[in-house]
Amino acid sequence: CDLPQTHSLGSRRTLMLLAQMRRISLFSCLKDRHDFGFPQEEFGNQFQKAETIPVLHEMIQQIFNLFSTKDSSAAWDETLLDKFYTELYQQLNDLEACVIQGVGVTETPLMKEDSILAVRKYFQRITLYLKEKKYSPCAWEVVRAEIMRSFSLSTNLQESLRSKE
């Protein structure tokens, strides 16, 4: 399955929107920075495309879930958030179309299941952090910067997949 060129453009737009969503300076939140343990190894180049697409799908789905909560709506600009949802939704559709085309429909390798679980646990840590910090502006800013980093890394994986074709 070939992810459309618009998919990588959408990824760049998503990163741009995340950057624009910034409301406060992270320099006022240095003490709130946190290591969420992004499972970078799950996004390594060792995977076949059949294994990466469900992991990428999980990543984007979890970002969508994170920013779709009531607490998130209160934290961010509504217009930017709506554009952000639209970009994520389109990327989810692109990835789902690939799965339907037959990539990853065979018996799920254990490694892929472990990777999806690692991504879910990563987002659980982020959710727990926000809860512990009572969804403060600094906590959301730390999370926004973290999602920018992890999304950027997963985007790099998509690009490396494309270049291998």
Epitope: A19, Q20, L26, L30, K31, R33, D35, G37, A145, E146
Partner: antibody, heavy 120, light 111 residues
Amino acid sequence: QVQLQESGTVLARPGASVKMSCKASGYSFTTYWMHWVKQRPGQGLEWIGVIYPGNGDTTYNQKFKDKAKLTAVTSANTAYMELSSLTNEDSAVYFCTRNYKYDYYTMDYWGQGTTVTVSS
Amino acid sequence: DIVLTQSPASLAVSLGQRATISCRASKSVSTSGHSYMHWYQQKPGQTPKLLIYLASNLESGVPARFSGSGSGTDFTLNIHPVEEEDAATYYCQHSGELPFTFGSGTKLEIK
């Protein structure tokens, strides 16, 4: 590729002001913090401050808050630093540097530096 | 301000041997799993180059002979085996709190 092109050598009188520029290319200028760093001849590095070109948000090292003013013009992809009330202590090379890794605050790309010489 | 003390101020190392540079912070620069200490290399007449970020992460394109370690207040940059092109001044920098500061530098000479 990412490039930061700084203005050339500046010679200024004590008490004067100078404004140097840093033109960015090869990346999204508005979404990366831009740091400024001072290096006196044969000496170490000093962090002056940082600007977010996307909205002009600035954070300064308190030591430089009355000395340096950081601005950016997004339409020109250019960051600026103005130094006022110059003294001999301000004679140095000034680097603009791009922020890296979001909230780690390291500097991955550096301009070639603007040399400022203050002399009467 | 957090003061970063680098030692030694200069060292001479034979080709192929190990160079060890230390950076001590006056206050911890580690929080919640990250150590906000970074290392740069500056060759004469050139701009600084990022080598290591977050104490131990090798920047893309930097040779594997460079490595960083440490947490809290004590950090180390190791170069092994040292090559001719490694002759430079090395700086540590923290981003634990404002203002960010740099070490005074360590000049490495290759014998």
